[in-house]
């Protein structure tokens, strides 16, 4: 079938998930985008093991996560529960920040240099981690 | 041979609809996202729609988007475009398209089918 | 959307000059910025993505610069068919959209 056992080149395996991290920036949603079309999602951290994972992969570097309050609560692009889910937000973030003079608050989260996650304006062209779960129907390795 | 070939184009009323098809051949068509890009008569390009390997994610042109639909069938190696509502700013070649992805995190067309040409006229 | 503007819209040039075609955007688009080449009849071709790097079987007289929102493709000795319509495209934001094109004519 077109279920995918081990991962794309250039794409990590780690507990039965593949993770490819961007080096450079996109938008929010234009880094969704292209996970999606590689049949992937933005990352969802559900776990403190998978966070220490990523972080070791990205380093000190604003990276966008799945995870935007868009739509009024805080939702992971998977449909994983927030409310019930891991966490690992700066102090006092979420804050939803007017401040920056970039119209609206802040509806997108990210890892910031020290891991922890903030909320930012989404358009920020931040770099961006996929993750997609083995044995699914799933993305082509780069060919060019 | 690496190639596309589309088919399904031709001559249809505004208001009408018309199903493209492209044929994929000497690649995994089954993990290489695709797309559907236009080119009026004597104009430039225009991307029109695409679609992931799986076929579980599909994006559209504000132009087109409740208009066309854009499908593949893995297990024929086959992409479609289903158009319906057809206007006349809708004419011209369409051409099926092969999304490279790049280890920067692009996505280009690396890969052209020879187009076929859809005219909508009464 | 992000509009590409391609100039010069005509570059008539004879064989063995040098090519220059520009590509700005009207806002940064990082280095996700690919060039096409499209001969009369054809389909276009890819040259350069990421904007420098050459596509696949590609002769190095081609080459890409630029990032951000300013970007240059370059023929460095133009042959006879090379004279052909050439076009832009980014990727940075949805939707892809492409340049106005630059024709490349015999002069």
């Known amino acids: 079938g077109s279920e995918r056992t081990c991962c794309p080149v250039n794409w990590v395996e780690h507990e039965r998930s593949c993770y490819w991290f961007s080096r450079s920036g996109k938008a929010w949603a234009d880094a969704d985008n292209y996970c999606r079309l590689e049949d992937a999602h933005l990352v969802v951290v559900t776990s403190w093991e998978e966070q220490k994972f990523v972080q070791h992969h990205i380093g000190p570097v604003n990276t966008w996560m799945g995870l935007h309050d868009q739509n009024g609560p805080w939702k992971w692009v998977d449909g994983t529960d927030y409310e019930t889910g891991f966490k690992n937000w700066r102090p006092e973030q979420p804050d939803d920040w007017y401040g920056h003079g970039l119209g609206g608050g802040e509806d997108c989260a990210h890892f910031t240099d020290d891991g922890r996650w903030n909320d930012d304006v989404c358009q920020r062209p931040y770099r961006w981690v996929c993750e997609t779960e083995l044995d699914k129907a799933s993305q082509e390795p780069p060919l060019l | 041979e690496v190639q596309l070939l589309e088919s399904g184009g031709g001559l249809v009323q505004p208001g009408g609809s018309l199903r493209l098809s492209c044929a994929a051949s000497g690649f995994t068509f089954s993990t290489s996202p695709m797309s559907w890009v236009r080119q009026a008569p004597g104009k430039g390009l225009e991307w029109v729609s695409a679609?992931?390997?799986?076929?579980?994610?599909?994006f559209y042109a504000d132009s087109v988007k409740g208009r066309f639909t854009i499908s593949r069938d893995n297990s024929k190696n086959t992409l479609y475009l289903q158009m319906n509502s057809l206007r006349a700013e809708d004419t011209a070649v369409y051409y099926c398209a092969k999304l490279g992805t790049t280890v920067s995190g692009g996505h280009y067309f690396d890969l052209w089918g020879r187009g076929t040409l859809v005219t909508v006229s009464s | 959307e992000i509009v590409l503007t391609q100039s010069p819209a005509t570059l008539s040039l004879s064989p063995g000059e040098r090519a220059t075609l520009s590509c700005r955007a009207s806002?940064?688009?990082?280095?996700?910025l690919a060039w096409y080449q499209q001969k009369p009849g054809q389909a276009p071709r890819l040259l350069i993505y990421?904007?420098?790097k050459r596509a696949t079987g590609i002769p190095a007289r081609f080459s890409g610069s630029g990032s951000g929102t300013d970007f240059t493709l370059t023929i460095s000795s133009l042959e006879p068919e090379d004279f052909a319509v050439y076009y832009c495209?980014?990727?940075?934001?949805?939707?892809?959209?492409f340049g106005g094109g630059t024709k490349v004519e015999i002069k």
């Open positions: 806002q940064s688009v990082s280095s996700y």
């Open positions: 990421d904007a420098s």
């Open positions: 679609i992931s390997g799986a076929g579980a994610s599909t």
């Open positions: 495209q980014q990727d940075s934001n949805h939707p892809l959209t």
